[in-house]
């Protein structure tokens, strides 16, 4: 039984990074709700003075790809492509270290924004990571 669906990205907030590419959604009508959540999150991020340029340059597309993961076209069943673990770790530990610390201690941000957990992603050299999304 299929757990989710592959459908063209129909929003606008992440269109610059995703275009009309096919994304994985857990239900057919989930896109709209996630679009509303991510625009609310971006508004909050933009209002915050805690986000550096070097972080936002990579964090924004990463959040888009995390919220709207590309479909794995090599799979016979609908399946999302993961972010690449090495890039996720660079983002969390180097480029956005201060921002992550702030975000993880801020309930308002956590409520609106699901941050990727790098430890959940496959190891760089594993077969599962071969098709990961590079920012």
């Amino acid at each position: 039984e299929e757990d989710g669906f592959c459908q063209p990205y129909r929003g606008i907030a992440c269109a610059r990074f995703i275009g009309n590419r096919t994304v994985y959604m857990e239900s057919l009508h989930m896109q709209g709700e996630i679009e509303n959540q991510i625009t609310a999150a971006f508004t909050m991020i933009g209002t915050s003075s805690h986000l550096s340029d070097k972080c936002s340059q990579f964090a924004i597309p990463s959040l888009c790809h995390y919220a709207f993961p590309y479909c794995d076209e090599t799979s016979s069943v609908p399946k999302p492509r993961d972010l690449c673990r090495d890039e996720c770790e660079i983002l969390e530990n180097v480029l956005c270290q201060t921002e992550y610390i702030f975000a993880r201690s801020n309930p308002m941000i956590l409520m609106r924004l699901k941050l990727p957990n790098c430890e959940d992603l496959p190891q760089p050299e594993s077969p599962e990571a071969a098709n990961c999304i590079r920012i």
């Epitope: 063209p8 129909r10 606008i12 907030a13 992440c14 269109a15 610059r16 990074f17 057919l28 009508h29 709209g32 679009e35 509303n36 625009t39 971006f42 508004t43 933009g46 209002t47 924004i60 888009c64």
Partner: antibody, heavy 117, light 107 residues
Framework: EVQLVESGGGLVQPGGSLRLSCAAS????????IHWVRQAPGKGLEWVAA????????RYADSVKGRFTISADTSKNTAYLQMNSLRAEDTAVYYC??????????WGQGTLVTVSS | DIQMTQSPSSLSASVGDRVTITCRAS??????VAWYQQKPGKAPKLLIY???SLYSGVPSRFSGSRSGTDFTLTISSLQPEDFATYYC?????????FGQGTKVEIK
């Protein structure tokens, strides 16, 4: 108070260009998608284009793709619609509107664009 | 593109009447439908979003409902200020599309 004010409309010859402006106030401009919707005289509403200023992401109707360009200047809280290669069928009142949970909750008063020789 | 077929194109009604306007989507749009009211020479005003959510400040006599790909705007008791043109709009996918409009006139 949320406000959207369009300007830049006028009479232009076929093949000509025009740039419309939409000045926004009363809300966090970059966090909302801004749309342009037009209405030909005596006709219905037609969605034209949209921009999400925070990521500079854009979308266009097929009828204007390649001729119109939507942009935004977050320092001025203003969205623009650059219209090139104008045709008679582009004659309409052009409204800018703010996206609220993906419906349009605030609209400007509209600006008339007339394409005629 | 998703087509929104609105009916009727016009109707005549009296103050106090119950008025129903329907929109049919050419494919599934979930509940991503809004309804607007427009008066001559004015910008449209949002009435309903997400098929049935009443927008802030809109009188409760306006309501929206969904049944599959059919969407309905109901005015429970028509008031003099309700005579206008009404449009439905889908926002599940770009390009966003509007219905052709329904003009509500005084009988």
């Amino acid at each position: 108070e949320v406000q959207l004010v369009e300007s830049g409309g006028g009479l232009v010859q076929p093949g000509g260009s025009l740039r419309l402006s939409c000045a926004a106030s009363g809300f966090t401009f970059y966090g909302y998608t801004i749309h342009w919707v037009r209405q030909a005289p005596g006709k219905g509403l037609e969605w034209v284009a949209a921009i999400y200023p925070y990521t500079d992401s854009t979308r266009y109707a097929d009828s204007v793709k390649g001729r119109f360009t939507i942009s935004a200047d977050t320092s001025k809280n203003t969205a623009y619609l650059q219209m090139n290669s104008l045709r008679a069928e582009d004659t309409a009142v052009y409204y800018c509107a703010r996206d609220y949970r993906r419906a349009l909750d605030y609209w400007g008063q509209g600006t008339l664009v007339t394409v005629s020789s | 593109d998703i087509q929104m077929t609105q009916s009727p194109s016009s109707l005549s009604a009296s103050v106090g009447d119950r008025v129903t306007i329907t929109c049919r989507a050419s494919q599934s749009v979930s509940s991503a439908v809004a309804w607007y009211q427009q008066k001559p020479g004015k910008a449209p005003k949002l009435l309903i979003y997400s098929a049935s959510s009443l927008y802030s400040g809109v009188p409760s006599r306006f309501s929206g409902s969904r049944s599959g790909t059919d969407f309905t705007l109901t005015i429970s008791s028509l008031q003099p200020e309700d005579f206008a043109t009404y449009y439905c709009q889908q926002y599940t996918d770009f390009p966003w599309t509007f219905g052709q409009g329904t003009k509500v006139e005084i009988k």
